[in-house]
């Protein structure tokens, strides 16, 4: 296994609809054809998997149907979008990239993106 550099933004603020997007860029040392991208969340001394997708270079990134993540890939960049976020989901979201094929296997872990989620205030009752 070999190490690989992964870059991602330090901070992202989720939209009022609970959607956060960020780019995960990896420095591919070779010509990988199969790449696995995993989003991890670190909070309260625990790391949990948020979502994961394996894709072939040049093809679309496909997450499971019930995943809260969507994404697109372009070269060595993956554009990730996480939806359905609430204030309690605030935390450090880490991009993990694995070059699965061809060998050798490479592993890269980003420094994490701190995603802040603010629940919208409920609208006051209107007389109209």
């Amino acid at each position: 296994c070999k190490a690989m550099h992964v870059a991602q933004p330090a901070v992202v603020l989720a939209s009022s609809r609970g959607i956060a997007s960020f780019v995960c860029e990896y420095a591919s040392p070779g010509k990988a054809t199969e790449v696995r991208v995993t989003v991890l969340r670190q909070a309260d001394s625990q790391v949990t998997e948020v979502c994961a997708a394996t894709y072939m270079m040049g093809n679309e990134l496909t997450f499971l149907d019930d995943s809260i993540c969507t994404g697109t890939s372009s070269g060595n960049q993956v554009n990730l979008t996480i939806q359905g976020l609430r204030a309690m989901d605030t935390g450090l979201y880490i991009c993990k990239v694995e070059l699965m094929y061809p060998p050798p296997y490479y592993l890269g872990i980003g420094n994490g993106t701190q995603i802040y989620v603010i629940d919208p205030e409920p609208c006051p009752d209107s007389d109209f």
Partner: nanobody, 126 residues
């Protein structure tokens, strides 16, 4: 709250083997840096081994190099210390320690640890 629990200690003859396990209750050890320490009677506690959060880096004290092997068993949410060719001087209480570092340090062993287990006794004697 995560707690560390060691198991696998016991009495073994010189030259024998033991397999210590460090498991987590109340959470997972995924990406935690895990260290193994031991304390022999009348001696200071010493670190014998550690494994990084990714599992790619392992360190060993000179006294156990080539005899001890540390590994992660993610399927069982545990870290294993395989001890071979045991000697009388390996006798002591073995402690599992852990710390979840910032992701930028997941490929390294921790310099200090937040969490300690209760320890398991290892006795090497004929």
């Amino acid at each position: 709250e995560v707690q560390l629990v060691e198991s696998g200690g016991g009495l073994v003859q010189p030259g024998g083997s033991l397999r210590l396990s460090c498991a987590a209750s109340g959470g997972t050890l995924d990406y935690w840096s895990i260290g193994w320490f031991r304390q022999a009677p009348g001696k200071e506690r010493e670190e014998v081994s550690c494994i990084s959060g990714t599992g790619l880096r392992t360190n060993y004290a000179d006294s156990v190099k080539g005899r001890f092997t540390v590994s992660r068993d993610n399927s069982k949410n545990s870290v294993i210390l395989q001890m071979n060719s045991l000697r009388a001087e390996d006798t002591g209480v073995y402690y599992c320690t852990g710390k979840l570092l910032h992701p930028s340090l997941w490929s390294a062993c921790a310099n200090e640890y937040d969490l300690w287990g209760q320890g398991t006794q290892v006795t090497v004697s004929s």
